[in-house]
């Protein structure tokens, strides 16, 4: 076991603050919620604290919830691949490029990192080159959230990940919006860190609305689990 | 419309040799990595051999190593796969998909899965005779 390991053997609580500009639109959100690494288990609440928010909920789903990729449930025998809590409590960054098909991209930076006893994700997020009456601006998505795996791979130059993964966004129209994703993870600490196999991800999301709350908001319930060591993804990395 | 039209298949002695052709359209081919997959009756769809045509990037399953290459014609807009020293068990429907991204090079890389892929051919069978 890892040192980082040995903190996420509990229910941890998680604080999650971003800072938004898309196309110029500001926005901030405020997150609070509590992860379970022996379940791989995400629950959190979002709130928009600057009115509403000028893209679609699910968009952000990734930044959120996949910046905290440390409460991955990774099963025994795969525990030396779970670069995310072997980073901790110092943490990593987490840099990512989304590019939605057809429309605009998200550039995000994040640091994630326990402060005393909760995991706080700190994100600033860019959006440029979106369409006014896109499927992102133009809130045409649906709000719920498709399963997906996150491919993740050592880069032993930096010290840390990469990471590729695509979403599918369902849009109210019976279509589908991809979102590639390109992410980037390094150590904050100069401590050691596991430098994992090719392996991946598999997460299963579910989002609701607290019917008692006024403002924007969206609530995110999540399981994340480490699997199998895939084939064929070395060739790009040798 | 997107459409992908897989052609060459046919019927071929264990030690012969095929080669499938993919024809795409309705898309822009650099945009995409164009994969090669086959299923055998009752088996899984399983991935062949894939490429970026950006840049050329390939990935093949270990079955295939040695024995199959893929390329592809960039002014065609086409993908082939070359298929040599064919046996028995490479009989099966073999089907051409796209595979949306930003950098097509790293979803090859990664050898991504059938459910992956956004756009799929009908398929043109080979079967290998012992």
């Known amino acids: 076991m890892s040192k980082g390991e040995e903190l996420f053997t509990g229910v941890v609580p998680i604080l999650v603050e971003l800072d938004g500009d898309v196309n110029g639109h500001k926005f901030s959100v405020s997150g609070e919620g509590e992860g379970d690494a022996t379940y791989g288990k995400l629950t959190l609440k979002f709130i928009c604290t600057t009115g509403k928010l000028p893209v679609p909920w699910p968009t952000l789903v990734t930044t959120f919830s996949y910046g905290v990729q440390c409460f991955s449930r990774y099963p025994d025998h795969m525990k030396q691949h779970d670069f995310f809590k072997s980073a901790m409590p110092e943490g990593y960054v987490q840099e990512r490029t989304i590019f939605f098909k057809d429309d605009g991209n998200y550039k995000t930076r994040a640091e994630v990192k326990f402060e005393g006893d909760t995991l706080v994700n700190r994100i600033e997020l860019k959006g440029i080159d979106f369409k006014e009456d896109g499927n992102i601006l133009g809130h045409k998505l649906e709000y719920n959230y498709n399963s997906h795996n996150v491919y993740i791979m050592a880069d032993k130059q930096k010290n840390g990940i990469k990471v590729n993964f695509k979403i599918r966004h369902n849009i109210e129209d019976g279509s589908v919006q991809l979102a590639d994703h390109y992410q980037q993870n390094t150590p904050i600490g100069d401590g050691p860190v596991l430098l994992p196999d090719n392996h991946y991800l598999s997460t299963q999301s579910a989002l609701s609305k607290d019917p008692n709350e006024k403002r924007d908001h969206m609530v995110l319930l999540e399981f994340v689990t480490a699997a199998g060591i895939t084939h064929g993804m070395d060739e790009l990395y040798k | 419309q997107v459409q992908l039209v897989e052609s060459g298949g046919g019927l071929v002695q264990a030690g012969g040799s095929l080669r499938l052709s993919c024809v795409t359209s309705?898309?822009?081919?650099?945009?995409?990595?164009i994969g090669w997959f086959r299923q055998a009756p009752g088996k899984e769809r399983e991935g062949v051999s894939s490429?970026?045509?950006?840049?050329?990037?390939?990935y093949y399953a270990d079955s295939v190593k040695g024995r199959f290459t893929i390329s592809s014609d960039n002014a065609k807009n086409t993908v082939y796969l070359q298929m040599n020293n064919l046996k028995p068990e490479d009989t099966a429907v073999y089907y051409c998909?796209?595979?949306?991204?930003?950098?097509?090079?790293?979803?090859?890389?990664?050898?991504?899965?059938?459910?992956?892929?956004?756009?799929w051919g009908q398929g043109t069978q080979v079967t290998v005779s012992s």
């Open positions: 309705g898309f822009t081919f650099d945009d995409y990595a």
């Open positions: 490429i970026s045509s950006s840049d050329g990037t390939t």
């Open positions: 998909a796209a595979d949306w991204a930003a950098w097509p090079s790293i979803r090859v890389g990664v050898g991504v899965p059938a459910y992956e892929y956004d756009y």
